[in-house]
């Protein structure tokens, strides 16, 4: 269960892959596309609103939790739309929905090396958001082999890595980026 109904914090960040391709969104009222693509220099990067929640349930992987709590996120590219896992189709979808959000919209946030994160489905432990054929997809990860698999690694490029360390709390986190002082937007919600 998610602790509380309000996020503990929120931030706007552009999402890119381990190989620095950008995740971009094209939404209309009744249709959408999610692209994984190289952007031109003048193209403004799409941002997603990450809302951070504490969960009492550990995921299938240990290490990122604090006192048995896991950090979960929802990802929203615009008002009223959220990324959701479709476990049957192994797909990542955009849905317009109202709060409270369904479990499919929640992802356990894991901190990885090189300032990367990964997103594990709350509804299907061991399954992560990943990149397949220039699209987002759900990818099953064999923990014994593919923990560092590049296709499930993402960069939150406009979040200060120190902020990431603070909210994720991974003990082995290292700030390898001298440009860590990127400005980020986040709002604390007091319960």
């Amino acid at each position: 269960s998610i602790t509380g109904i309000s996020p503990i914090t929120e931030s706007l960040a552009s999402l890119s892959t381990y190989n620095d391709q950008s995740i971009t969104f094209a939404l209309e009222d009744e249709s959408y596309e999610i692209y994984v693509e190289d952007l031109k220099k003048d193209k403004k990067k799409d941002k997603v609103l990450l809302s951070y929640y504490e969960s009492q349930h550990p995921s299938s992987e240990s290490g990122d939790g604090v006192d048995g709590k896991m950090l979960m996120v929802t990802l929203s590219p615009t008002k009223d739309f959220w990324l959701q896992a479709n476990n049957k189709e192994h797909s990542v979808e955009l849905h317009k929905c109202e709060k409270p959000l369904p479990d499919q919209a929640f992802f356990v946030l894991h901190n990885r090396s090189f300032n990367c994160v990964s997103f594990e489905c709350k509804t299907d432990p061991g399954v992560f958001i990943g990149v397949k054929d220039n699209h987002l997809a759900l990818i099953k990860v064999d923990y014994s082999e593919n923990l560092g698999s590049e296709n499930i690694l993402f960069k939150l490029s406009e979040i200060n890595p120190a902020f990431l360390y603070k909210v994720v709390g991974a003990a082995d986190y290292k700030d390898d980026d001298d440009k860590a002082a990127h400005h980020h937007h986040h709002h604390h919600h007091h319960h």
Epitope: F25, A26, L27, D29, T78
Partner: antibody, heavy 126, light 106 residues
Framework: EVQLLESGGGLVQPGGSLRLSCAAS????????MSWVRQAPGKGLEWVSA????????YYADSVKGRFTISRDNSKNTLYLQMNSLRAEDTAVYYC????????WGGGLRYPFGYWGQGTMVTVSS | LPVLTQPPSVSVSPGQKASITCSGE??????AAWYQQKPGQSPILVIY???KRPSGIPERFSGSNSGNTATLTISGTQDMDEADYYC?????????FGGGTKVTVL
């Protein structure tokens, strides 16, 4: 079906004012940035002004800055263009246009004009 | 702001290829859109993000953009393609259109 219907055009004297409206239907109006684009008789297209989905951000071409004001009423699904201190060179067909896609966090103007109204004629002449 | 330069007119025989250029400084660094406008009608988006076609636009319309020039190509031009065509980019939250090109199908 997306529909944009402009109104409010007409004949006005130089220095006068006019308010154009664009009634939108068939989509979630407040989710999209909207623009006004004009076309003088026998000439090309000229972008005039744009406004974010919420109405919180507005943008203007240098040629109309300080004279024109763009606004929107999301409860009425209507876009407006208040035109003051009109000049002869403002004579044109004025189109309202909707962004192709919903505006994302971070805003800004970057999408093409996916849908256009039929236009309303504004003539500035004495 | 960039100045987008288009040829005033292009003539093409039915079934042949028509190419319309749109030149501007560092054009290839921006995303170009193209609009078709027939006499007495509103413009229609035919190409966006340099190469993408909206639904309902025939496959004979294609686009490219590199260096200082974006190009709209109509392969197998038909009589119904006779119209004015405008390129457009965003530059610092300002919309910029090219001067337009009249395509005549001979």
């Amino acid at each position: 079906e997306v529909q944009l219907l402009e109104s409010g055009g007409g004949l006005v004297q130089p220095g006068g004012s006019l308010r154009l409206s664009c009634a939108a239907s068939g989509f979630t109006f407040s989710s999209y940035a909207m623009s006004w684009v004009r076309q003088a008789p026998g000439k090309g297209l000229e972008w005039v002004s744009a406004i974010s989905g919420s109405g919180g951000s507005t943008y203007y071409a240098d040629s109309v800055k300080g004279r024109f004001t763009i606004s929107r009423d999301n409860s009425k699904n209507t876009l407006y263009l208040q035109m003051n201190s009109l000049r002869a060179e403002d004579t044109a067909v004025y189109y309202c246009a909707r962004d192709l896609w919903i505006q994302l966090w971070g805003g800004g103007l970057r999408y093409p004009f996916g849908y256009w109204g039929q236009g309303t004629m504004v003539t500035v002449s004495s | 702001l960039p100045v987008l330069t288009q040829p005033p007119s292009v003539s093409v025989s039915p079934g042949q290829k028509a190419s319309i250029t749109c030149s501007g400084e560092r054009m290839g660094d921006k995303y170009a859109a193209w609009y078709q406008q027939k006499p007495g009608q509103s413009p229609i988006l035919v190409i966006y993000q340099d190469t993408k076609r909206p639904s309902g636009i025939p496959e004979r319309f294609s686009g490219s953009n590199s260096g200082n020039t974006a190009t709209l190509t109509i392969s197998g031009t038909q009589d119904m393609d006779e119209a004015d065509y405008y390129c457009q980019v965003w530059d610092s939250s300002t919309g910029v259109f090219g001067g337009g090109t009249k395509v005549t199908v001979l």
